[in-house]
């Protein structure tokens, strides 16, 4: 009779073993083992014993003991289990973006693996097991559906393997593949709200503002202003779950004419665009034209204004005519006229809009000077000792210099406070003096004496 | 323009006579004034004849000095001058008759010395 | 009488520093007051008329204010041809007046 020792063996892949072959008769006429495994024989004493030590077991393997002996041949086997981990345990690769309410399917494969009935499968959302299988067949595949919710966000999937060989006296041997982030996203069906100005006039800023409500995470989203060809350099500022967006646009000559202006909102792998249309236009104020801005009483005045060529002005009220981009009036300058101003409105039509735009200019009239009985009398009586104040208002542009003087010497003083005395009483020739010329006026001032009974 | 002359050594006691000769305006619409500058001291008014001819004298030069005039010249006479009227006389026309800056005619001067 | 009191009498000053010299007349004057700047040797240079006005080629750092009996003369930004003495004059009343000008104020510049 043949035996064999250890009748069963679990070993690591590669691993060696020695295997006892041993024979119950004393003299037997062969004794051996049969395997397609490398051997090496171990030398022992005696005949009905032989040892030998088998090597680089790569698989299960029934390595068979054979003897022959006076009473016949017999055999006897081996079992070698054959145990290894996993060589690749890995999830399916997916977008770390996933938008909240979706499925999201997770698939692990598992590669190799021995012996398989000890082998299972575990799909985890970070501690939490989420499906446990045994691996089946090769690669041995395990899915599970997760719907994505808002706090899944930052979430690590993991896949695990699980070689239980603690029944065969061994441990547990766990492989974990690399984790799967789960970032997740909710970024509405609407598109964002584009607040800008329809016209932007050359040479001038404008504010543009895109918002959007019920996004996540908000902190996440990515927005993209621009104008044309010219990205816009937004300032955020985040809610809860909406963000406004808010850039300044300065707009050139070169950017006249109809401009696209987009904001783009994106989040996860997804976007929401919103486009509208802004006019660019120039427009220069209107031009008001004096034939001089200072002219002497009498002369003739030509007011012209001009503006832009599709634009419609009124100077000083009144329609061009026709109605145009050039409107003028002529008058005759007279004092009256001194500081009036000549008002020029133009309007011009862009996108559906009404623009004005205005331009003054101011009209001196160089007159005068001017002395006349109404502002400076020619007589005054008062009473002495009595407090007096001598008034007389010479008119004219410039605004003449007034000197009132008796005997070219004494002063009367225009417009202070004086006590009457005789002193003051006499002629006094006042003398108005511009750029514009002169004139003289004669000004007596009587003094009454107080009558003494 | 305004310029002086006359003036020069004088014996005490004695009198003399200034002479100022005014160009470019008319003593009809102008009054002109004398003031005087004794060496190291400061001006002092003495008195003015006005666009009518009427004069006007400081308190103290009252009776001492005449103002006069003709179309184109204005006379200072010093009657007994003492060694305390050597100074420098100017002729002024009157400081407020104008309008710009262009008045405030000063002649030179002319020194008065008194001395015996 | 119309008579005016200047003060103080002299005064020394820094170049770039600011001087200011008063005139007091004994009765109202309104605004009938001039300034003059005279060198030693020249004749008297006119600056300042109707208290606050400046004559042509006067540099603006010459400054008249007042009206009534009090007057003053300010000079910004001395600089050393600003050496001089000061006089004030009324120019109100040729007649009842013991002297027309100020006595003077002589500005020393160091």
């Known amino acids: 009779q043949t035996s064999v020792s250890p009748s069963k063996v679990i070993l690591p892949r590669g691993g060696s073993v020695l295997v006892t072959c041993s024979t119950s008769c004393d003299q037997p006429k062969l004794l051996g083992i049969e395997t397609p495994l490398p051997k090496k024989e171990l030398l022992l004493p005696g005949n009905n014993r032989k040892v030998y030590e088998l090597s680089n077991v790569q698989e299960d393997s029934q390595p068979m003991c054979y003897s022959n002996c006076p009473d016949g041949q017999s055999t006897a086997k081996t079992f070698l289990t054959v145990y290894w981990t996993p060589e690749r345990v890995e999830l399916a690769p997916l977008p770390s973006w996933q938008p909240v309410g979706k499925n999201l399917t997770l698939r692990c494969q598992v590669e190799g693996g021995a012996p398989r009935a000890n082998l299972t499968v575990v799909l985890l959302r970070g501690e939490k097991e989420l499906k446990r299988e045994p691996a089946v067949g090769e690669p041995a595949e395990v899915t599970t559906t997760v719907l994505v919710r808002r706090d899944h966000h930052g979430a690590n999937f993991s896949c695990r393997t699980e070689l239980d060989l603690r029944p065969q006296g061994l441990e547990l041997f766990e492989n974990t593949s690399a984790p799967y982030q789960l970032q997740t996203f909710v970024l509405p069906a609407t598109p964002p709200q584009l607040v800008s100005p329809r016209v932007l006039e050359v040479d001038t800023q404008g504010t543009v503002v895109c918002s959007l409500d019920g996004l996540f995470p908000v902190s996440e989203a990515q927005v993209h202003l621009a104008l044309g060809d010219q990205r816009l350099n937004p300032t955020v500022t985040y809610g809860n779950d909406s963000f406004s967006a808010k850039a300044s646009v300065s707009v050139t000559a070169e950017d006249e004419g109809t401009q696209r202006l987009t904001c783009a909102v994106i989040l996860g792998n997804q976007s929401q665009e919103t486009l509208q249309t802004v006019t660019i236009y120039s427009f220069p104020a209107p031009n008001v034209i004096l034939t001089k801005p200072e002219v002497s009483e009498g002369t003739e005045v030509t007011v012209k204004c001009e503006a832009h060529p599709r634009a419609k002005v009124t100077l000083n009220g009144v329609p061009a005519q026709p109605l145009g981009p050039r409107a003028q009036l002529l008058l005759k300058a007279t004092p009256e006229d001194n500081g009036r101003s000549f008002s020029c409105s133009a309007t011009l039509e862009v996108a559906g809009q009404l623009i004005h735009k205005n331009q003054t200019r101011e009209l001196r009239v160089l007159y005068g000077p001017r002395l006349d009985e109404r502002d400076c009398p020619g007589n005054w009586t008062w009473p002495e000792n009595s407090q007096q104040t001598p008034m007389c208002q010479a008119w004219g542009n410039p605004l003449p210099e007034l000197k009132c003087l008796k005997d070219g010497t004494f002063p009367l003083p225009i417009g202070e406070s004086v006590t009457v005395t005789r002193d003051l009483e006499g002629t006094y020739l006042c003398r108005a003096r511009s750029t514009q010329g002169e004139v003289t006026r004669k000004v007596t001032v009587n003094v009454l004496s107080p009558r003494y009974e | 323009s305004v310029e002086e002359s006359g003036g020069g050594l004088v014996k005490p006691g004695g009198t003399l006579t200034l002479t100022c000769t005014v160009s470019?305006?008319?003593?009809?619409?102008?009054?002109m004034g004398w003031v005087r500058q004794a060496p190291g001291k400061g001006l002092e008014y003495i008195g003015i004849?006005?666009?009518?001819?009427r004069t006007y004298y400081a308190s103290w030069a009252k009776g001492r000095f005449t103002i006069s005039k003709t179309s184109t010249t204005v006379d200072l006479k010093i009657t007994s001058p003492t060694t305390e009227d050597t100074a420098t006389y100017f002729c002024?026309?009157?400081?407020?008759?104008?309008?710009?800056?262009?008045?405030?005619?000063w002649g030179p001067g002319t020194l008065v010395t008194v001395s015996s | 009488a119309y008579d005016m009191t200047q003060t103080p009498a002299s005064v020394e000053v820094a170049v770039g520093g600011t001087v200011t010299i008063k005139c007091q007349a004994s009765?109202?004057?309104?605004?009938?007051l001039s300034w003059y700047q005279q060198k030693p040797g020249q004749r008297p240079k006119f600056l300042i008329y109707?208290?606050?006005k400046v004559a042509s080629g006067v540099p603006s750092r010459f400054k008249g204010s007042g009206s009534g009996t009090e007057f003053t003369l300010t000079i910004s930004a001395v600089q050393s041809d600003d050496a001089a003495t000061y006089y004030c004059?009324?120019?109100?009343?040729?007649?009842?007046?013991?002297?027309?000008f100020g006595g003077g104020t002589e500005v020393m510049v160091k």
């Open positions: 470019g305006f008319s003593l009809s619409t102008h009054a």
């Open positions: 109707d208290a606050s």
């Open positions: 009765q109202s004057i309104y605004s009938y």
């Open positions: 004059q009324q120019a109100y009343s040729s007649s009842n007046v013991d002297n027309a």
């Open positions: 004849i006005g666009s009518s001819d």
């Open positions: 002024v026309r009157d400081p407020y008759d104008s309008f710009d800056d262009g008045y405030r005619l």
